[in-house]
Interface confidence: low
């Protein structure tokens, strides 16, 4: 199974890698800074988006934020509404997609380097600081697209998914990152949690394949936040 | 297909030392995470280190319990992981195993019996 | 130290369904939604049957599949057949210095 490259994804929803509340490290989707692999509402479209009631973010999709429909609404109905992309207005980091964190009431890119000594001071605080490296070389990976001549298989080393074969994304596993599959129906999802809220995520999954997005077992909705599953599941 | 193959291991006295080595093929080795996993006799697993690849810098990880007695190595170019025990202790008499760490742990040798005793 | 809690043993007759119980904390098997499951036949080496809680490698029978819920992951095999009698071992991440850990195993014996 630790780079710490960071994907867009990831810096938009720092999991707790360490049993925190959410019980949830990693999913999401390894990408090179600036490509955006979603899953949540990504093949949703206005006319077939089905209202889904929630009570927290952490119920809706990868690209969506839960909150009432109507500004100033009943704050009792709330409904998984669509992330606001770079530029729109917001309120918290919930509501911007992933790649972008609410700063100044609107949602900007989350530039790798702003993050970087933020991120690398929670993989210290949260994993613990005992590995080595040999050979003076760095923590950070430094792979070459020269690398690749042929797609990556399950498990093999990776920069982005596009480095990967057919069906497999590019997801960190502690810190390295590697080929692994794209989710199907009924496998376990990763909610993405918020930025700032917790620990780096030290695994990822790949996001759920096309026409599912990751939200919670119906089964587990009375169960404590710490122990909730999330599936992939049909829109 | 993807073979792994121990070799090392034998009866060693306490304090002596042993190198273990695990030839891999079927796979581009350099690309994957490789790692030692042991068990006693009679017993359960006990992960015992890994060693990333070179392009994450060749970080190592180990147990608590071999921290600092055991140090893991690669050599790309000959497609084999080594485990250098050093400081053995009676508790270390195990089978040791080499695993590829793809997602978790997919491929497994067949093991080596390393033997700590006076 | 073993980290995950199994039953030592379970047993079962041929097309029963049977389920293994793996117990951790907060600090390992609940703060991960990673347990892989892995199978062992006697002085053979050990096999991954299930990964990331409930993901099947290919190659692995659907009789196996795998859940978890807080602190406890399970493995349910059903249609019980003879050579599914083995040892089998959970295993997930862990924070502090052991980064990787096992379950103590459980033996699964087929009856008759």
């Known amino acids: 199974t630790l780079n710490s490259v960071l994907n867009s994804n990831a810096i938009k929803n720092l999991p707790p890698p360490l049993g925190g509340a959410a019980g949830h490290p990693g999913s999401a989707v390894s990408a090179a800074p600036g490509i955006l692999y979603p899953g949540g509402n990504k093949y949703q479209t206005i006319d077939n988006y089905q209202p889904y009631p929630c009570a927290e973010d952490e119920e809706c999709g990868t690209d969506e934020y839960c909150a009432s429909p109507t500004r100033g609404g009943d704050a009792g109905v709330q409904i998984c509404l669509a992330c606001r992309k770079r530029r729109k207005r917001c309120m918290r980091h919930a509501m911007c997609c992933p790649g972008n964190y609410c700063k100044n009431g609107i949602c900007v890119s989350s530039d790798q380097n702003n993050f970087r000594g933020e991120i690398e001071e929670t993989i210290t605080e949260s994993f613990g600081n005992d590995h080595s490296t040999l050979d003076g070389y760095s923590r950070r990976t430094t792979l070459s697209s020269k690398m690749y001549h042929s797609k990556g298989q399950e498990g093999s080393v990776c920069l982005r998914s596009s480095d990967c074969a057919t069906g497999l994304c590019c997801a960190r596993h502690f810190w390295s990152k590697i080929c692994k599959p794209v989710l199907k129906e009924g496998q376990v999802c990763t909610k993405h949690r918020r930025k700032g809220s917790h620990g780096l995520e030290i695994f990822q999954r790949c996001y759920c394949g096309e026409g599912l997005s990751c939200r919670i077992q119906k089964d587990h909705h009375q169960a404590s936040n710490s122990s909730r599953l999330h599936t992939c599941q049909r829109h | 297909q993807v073979q792994l193959v121990e070799s090392g291991g034998g009866l060693v006295q306490p304090g002596g030392s042993l190198r273990l080595s695990c030839a891999a093929s079927?796979?581009?080795?350099?690309?994957?995470?490789m790692s030692w996993v042991r068990q006693a006799p009679g017993k359960g697993l006990e992960w015992v280190s890994s060693?990333?690849?070179?392009?994450?810098?060749?970080?190592?990880w180990y147990a608590a319990g071999v921290k600092g007695r055991f140090t893991i190595s690669r050599d790309n170019s000959k497609n084999t992981l080594y485990l250098q025990m050093n400081s053995l202790r009676a508790e270390d008499t195990a089978v040791y195993y080499c695993?590829?760490?793809?997602?978790?742990?997919?491929?497994w040798g067949q093991g080596t019996l390393v033997t700590v005793s006076s | 130290d073993i980290a995950l809690t199994q039953p030592a043993s379970v047993s079962g007759s041929p097309g029963q369904s049977i389920t293994i119980s793996c117990t951790g904390t907060?600090?390992?098997?609940?703060?991960?939604?990673?347990v892989s499951w892995y199978q062992q036949h006697p002085g053979k080496a050990p096999k991954l049957m299930i990964y990331?809680?409930?993901n099947r490698p290919s190659g692995v029978s659907n009789r196996f599949s795998g859940s978890k819920s807080g602190n406890t992951a399970s493995l349910t095999i059903s249609g019980l057949q003879a050579e599914d009698e083995a040892d089998y071992y959970c295993?997930?991440?862990?924070?502090?210095?052991?980064?990787?850990?096992f379950g103590g195993g459980t033996k699964l014996t087929v009856l008759g």
């Open positions: 079927g796979f581009t080795f350099s690309s994957y995470w």
């Open positions: 907060s600090s390992d098997l609940g703060g991960y939604n990673y």
């Open positions: 295993q997930s991440y862990a924070s502090g210095n052991t980064k990787v850990v």
């Open positions: 695993a590829r760490h793809g997602i978790d742990f997919d491929h």
């Open positions: 060693i990333e690849h070179k392009d994450a810098g060749y970080t190592t």
């Open positions: 990331d809680v409930n």
